[in-house]
């Protein structure tokens, strides 16, 4: 048993890291695999990671901390039974990923005016809560080449939009992902996408 | 230093109750684990009750034989509790807090495995 | 509820004697196995976990081995200080139940 492509982890900075490889060979991960992992501080347990599979030769394992703080570093094993197949280590402040936004939602009462809002996915104690900007890709149902996105790089989890700017009597669609500035993270997920119609129409004079 | 304190034993009369205290300090914030209750009776062996994982889940593991009468519950990661209720003179015993690494796949099914670290034990007596 | 039968319940030795303690699980528990030294009045003491690895700051002496339902603890030489109460920990997969073993209480021939 052999791996193929070492294990390469990402943490949302709070409670999950996640860890992914590629094995030589179709491989039951969850049978045949397990990944230890031990925060580098006195006194600390070794913990077991049973893998999943992500695809036929690729494992996933999800490592969960209480918390993160800068310093935090892990030891990683991958054994095989009682073959070690590979050994690392992780440093979850140094490979960010945030959580997606959740609860996006598009309210059209507002005259001429779409307004987006949605949820920063941290709680105002973690480090990522102030540090979040973000992207907001917005598309037409029916012709997927009118998309845009806006990058929201204030604080507030919100953005408003004229109505005018998009077309009349269509569908449109919005979604949402996130990243922090000062960690260098990666973009998040994007967030489960909301869909509205836009039933704006110019004012008759404009016509 | 890291150490784990236990409080709340002593001498209770069957049929009643007792709360046992857990405090854990000197441990990483970071740390995701459990914390788990161990008993042992005079000059008998080590049995286990159950445990609660510190973290947000909270989730709790309990021994068969303890469900129902044992309660584990928790004031913070730090602080942990084992209600005991309808006590029988065979709950005599020392009772220990102890720390547990544990097995996880995915994140919500996570489940204690050894005890890593210890505390020195609280006694409790169950007698008229 | 898995079933650890602990052998022997106990033994005599002397200092420099190898002494091996097995453990038997009633169900594949995979590797989830610890091993405990215990001295009177004390509380319980990590040895070795996941079967085979040896726990921070215990003296190299001590090994475990097995996997499955079967496990060993081994004392290669016994020293003074090793004369106590030695517990396995199987951990049930199926369950998230935690047994101990009997005991073996390792005393001076």
């Known amino acids: 048993m052999k791996v193929l492509q070492e294990p390469t982890c990402v943490s949302d900075y709070m409670s999950i890291s996640t860890c992914e490889w590629k094995m030589g060979g179709p491989t039951n991960c969850s049978a045949e695999l397990r990944l230890l992992y031990q925060l580098v501080f006195q006194s600390s347990e070794t913990h077991t990671c049973v893998p999943e599979n992500n695809g036929g030769v690729g494992c996933v394992c999800h490592l969960l901390m209480d918390d993160v703080v800068s310093m935090d570093n892990y030891t990683l094993d991958l054994w095989a039974g009682q073959q070690l197949l590979w050994k690392g280590s992780f440093k979850p402040s140094e490979h960010v990923k945030p959580r997606a936004p959740g609860n996006l939602t598009v309210h059209t009462n507002v005259s001429d005016t779409v307004l987006l809002t949605w949820s920063n996915p941290y709680p105002p104690d973690n480090y990522l809560y102030n540090d979040l900007t973000y992207a907001v890709n917005i598309w037409n149902e029916n012709d997927l080449a009118d998309s845009r996105i806006h990058n929201v790089t204030y604080l507030k989890p919100t953005l408003r939009i004229p109505a005018s700017t998009l077309k009349s009597g269509i569908s449109y669609r919005a979604r949402v992902r996130a990243w922090a500035q000062h960690y260098n993270t990666t973009w998040s997920e994007w967030s489960p996408s909301t869909k509205w119609y836009n039933s704006y129409r110019e004012p008759f004079e404009q016509r | 230093e890291v150490q784990l304190v236990e409080s709340g034993g002593g001498r209770v009369q069957p049929g009643g109750s007792l709360r046992l205290s857990c405090a854990a300090s000197?441990?990483?914030?970071?740390?995701?684990?459990?914390m788990c209750w161990v008993r042992q009776a005079p000059g008998k062996g080590l049995e286990w009750i159950g445990c609660?994982?510190?973290?947000?889940?909270?989730?709790t593991y309990y021994a068969s034989w303890a469900k129902g009468r044992f309660t584990i519950s928790k004031a913070s990661s730090t602080t942990v509790y084992l209600q005991m209720n309808s006590l029988r003179a065979e709950d005599t015993a020392t009772y220990y807090c102890?720390?547990?690494?544990?097995?996880?796949?995915?994140?919500?099914?996570?489940?204690?495995?050894?005890?890593?670290?210890w505390g020195q034990g609280t006694q409790v007596t169950v007698s008229s | 509820d898995i079933q650890m039968t602990q052998s022997p319940s106990s033994l005599s030795a002397s200092v420099g004697d190898r002494v091996t303690i097995t453990c038997q699980a009633s169900?594949?528990?995979?590797?989830?196995l610890a091993w405990y030294q215990q001295k009177p009045g004390k509380a319980p003491k990590l040895l070795i976990y996941?079967?085979?690895t040896l726990a921070y700051g215990v003296p190299s002496r001590f090994s475990g081995s097995g996997s499955g339902t079967d496990f060993t603890l081994t004392i290669s030489s016994l020293q003074p200080e090793d004369f106590a109460t030695y517990y396995c920990?199987?951990?049930?997969?199926?369950?998230?139940?935690?047994?101990f073993g009997q005991g073996t209480k390792v005393e001076i021939k």
């Open positions: 102890a720390r547990a690494a544990f097995v996880n796949r995915g994140v919500s099914w996570i489940w204690p495995y050894y005890f890593s670290l």
């Open positions: 000197g441990f990483s914030s970071s740390s995701a684990h459990y």
């Open positions: 609660i994982y510190a973290g947000s889940r909270g989730s």
């Open positions: 169900e594949d528990i995979e590797s989830y």
């Open positions: 996941r079967a085979s």
């Open positions: 920990l199987g951990s049930s997969y199926s369950t998230g139940s935690n047994i």
